[in-house]
Amino acid sequence: GCLTQLYENAFFRGGDVASMYTPNAQYCQMRCTFHPRCLLFSFLPASSINDMEKRFGCFLKDSVTGTLPKVHRTGAVSGHSLKQCGHQISACHRDIYKGVDMRGVNFNVSKVSSVEECQKRCTSNIRCQFFSYATQTFHKAEYRNNCLLKYSPGGTPTAIKVLSNVESGFSLKPCALSEIGCHMNIFQHLAFSDVDVARVLTPDAFVCRTICTYHPNCLFFTFYTNVWKIESQRNVCLLKTSESGTPSSSTPQENTISGYSLLTCKRTLPEPCHSKIYPGVDFGGEELNVTFVKGVNVCQETCTKMIRCQFFTYSLLPEDCKEEKCKCFLRLSMDGSPTRIAYGTQGSSGYSLRLCNTGDNSVCTTKTSTRIVGGTNSSWGEWPWQVSLQVKLTAQRHLCGGSLIGHQWVLTAAHCFDGLPLQDVWRIYSGILNLSDITKDTPFSQIKEIIIHQNYKVSEGNHDIALIKLQAPLNYTEFQKPICLPSKGDTSTIYTNCWVTGWGFSKEKGEIQNILQKVNIPLVTNEECQKRYQDYKITQRMVCAGYKEGGKDACKGDSGGPLVCKHNGMWRLVGITSWGEGCARREQPGVYTKVAEYMDWILEKTQSSDGKAQMQSPA
């Protein structure tokens, strides 16, 4: 199961597998999640301990039982790895730490005007893992505005010191925000030179590449196939680095395969897991458990559900089978990779999917027509549920927004389809920020089914809600995640922190915006809203939002997009942008379809279409 809660003033005793310095508990938790054996962690903030050596200490722990005794320690924070937590699994860490200097090897110094610029430089430098920035008020004038790019052997700081007027953070390469770009090519019969940072066994070059991508110091790799001339080196994956960031030389070599880390890819990174099953292959390792199951897929599921399991072998040997079930060997190792790979066997092997973030996990995301007037630019991954509904007739254009609520479901406004009911003309773009980034090669989703509310009537404002079923399910990524839906009981809830997003007009007679806009808008009571719209009926199935003085609002092109509110610690889809009198006019709030009032309808439609609920509601 997925365990997300943190324990405060608690420290897990024993079970240590690794330790490092991290700036906070969340980063420590992320390191635990990606460590092959870590199930639990404990973190010591600077305030919790006098021992300078242990300040900011992050202790990664393993336990055969899945738990360890907790001891009281004031200020300490402990918790669980997020293995098995689906789309909460991410190596991306955006936070900036003020008053903290993260130490490492300083390999580049430059003057910049802001900490954001420093982080951008780190993200755009192939070797930079983290950085420190001296602000304009730093006590030594000659260091002010210095941006220090850093790395370390483990990818985490070698020490962390409290230091005034210094700000530190990590590269955003794991957020798929690097401008460097990446080499997707795999080079057959080619071996790279340079420094080996690690050696693991893998069944193919693709697993080798994924391991390289998530290794803190791997920039490229060479893989020796299972027919490599030296038997002891078969299936060896060598993770490599160099001073320049690229291989200094390469040698033609039969039965070797080389390639590059994909960490510098823009917009999309490979999942940190390996889903392929390898027939006729045995993976050796420490035995965790043996169970009888029906089929290799069930064996993989069993491994995935057992949190300590890293890989498995499903044996089809007659002596290992009874009736329709055969032995499923659940295994683990120190580094998460098999200790031996044997070919030509009667087994099938594969890896746990515990780090896959495509799982239809029940815990929904907690990140922080009509365009946004008076808004500001959004940043990558800020509103990962926002989609652009575009129509391709002779030309292609953005018409509406929408919200991703499940792998295969988008919620939008019914009026977006007025006069355009044909599903073939629509293209749905998810995981994007700039409309100008869309080219003919940009992947998009097509519509399998448009479900318009049965009581919606064209040119009326009532029941302005529609569901879109996508032809193929979407994977969740850092930039493409669902928004939690409310419960039916939320109909009377008062929300105080609400945002509207979209690419719509920035003024009434404007044009579609390139960068996704966001605006913080207060909700208005229905009574107040009704006073402003005396010619229309504001029903209980609508919610209004806007400033009395106007100036901030949704506008043409934002229709169908989300009105989201952070409530009790979670973002929820409260409204669907529907209509309004002009845009951002004084005392003319925007009107939104109230999602809580349609929860029965949403769940009924998505369940009847799928046989089970597929949207990412908090359930």
């Epitope: 809660q5 039916k488 008062i494 105080t496 979670m570 929860m599 908090p618």
Partner: antibody, heavy 117, light 107 residues
């Protein structure tokens, strides 16, 4: 860490009112609702109502409507639940509870209110 | 109001037993269900929910399942520290309502 500390036990006569307090710490008081739940001795749990301190918005179980008032003082991060026209069946432990999402992730220690003539 | 019914008010099991506690809603609550554990003299403690999964501090022997109106809480191997009363609660429709509770004991 999140802590909810409630006021002490009360003994009241039928027809009187009681006001129970719940002091919150360890989080931003105005960002989360505060709910009230009661439990008669040896019995189950019953939801009374809630307040959102940031907006002042309240929601009540109709069963208690007219008899219960939930308020919040932002300056002291304290929520209050006042129950009037007390009867013997109101004898219960009254809990304040703070949600994370919808479920009640944090609970006060409880306040025993005894209604007896 | 939605009624939540826990069919057995008490259950006695042996150490190591697999225990299942059931909860039935009077209408479909679409998985919006939480389970709480309460030990004598203490406040209830959130055990698991559709919103947050299994809470930290609880052993993985606890699991939940169900859909529609019918839900179950399972304990894979009953331990002495599991002796408590377990309540289900729906958060689909206000007023939020709780089941009557199931008191778990060891034989």
């Amino acid at each position: 860490q999140v802590q909810l500390v409630q006021s002490g036990a009360e003994v009241k006569k039928p027809g009187a009112s009681v006001k129970v307090s719940c002091k919150a710490s360890g989080y931003t008081f105005t960002d989360y609702e505060m709910h009230w739940v009661r439990q008669p001795p040896g019995k189950g749990l019953e939801w009374i109502g809630a307040i959102h301190p940031g907006s002042g918005g309240t929601a009540y179980n109709q069963k208690f409507k007219g008899r219960v008032t939930i308020t919040a003082d932002k300056s002291t991060s304290t929520a209050y639940m006042e129950l009037s026209s007390l009867r013997s069946e109101d004898t219960a432990v009254y809990y304040c509870a703070r949600p994370y999402g919808y479920p009640f992730a944090y609970w006060g220690q409880g306040t025993l209110v005894t209604v007896s003539s | 109001d939605i009624q939540m019914t826990q069919s057995s008010s008490s259950f006695s099991g042996s150490l190591g037993d697999r225990v299942t506690i059931t909860c039935k809603a009077s209408e479909d609550i679409y998985n919006r269900l939480a389970w709480y554990q309460q030990k004598p003299g203490n406040a209830p403690r959130l055990l698991m929910s559709g919103e947050t999964g299994l809470e930290a501090g609880f052993h993985l022997r606890f699991s939940g399942s169900g859909s529609g109106k019918d839900y179950t809480l399972s304990i894979a191997s009953l331990q002495t520290e599991d002796v408590a009363t377990y309540y289900c609660q729906q958060y689909w429709s206000t007023p939020w309502t709780f089941g009557g509770g199931t008191k778990l004991e060891i034989k």
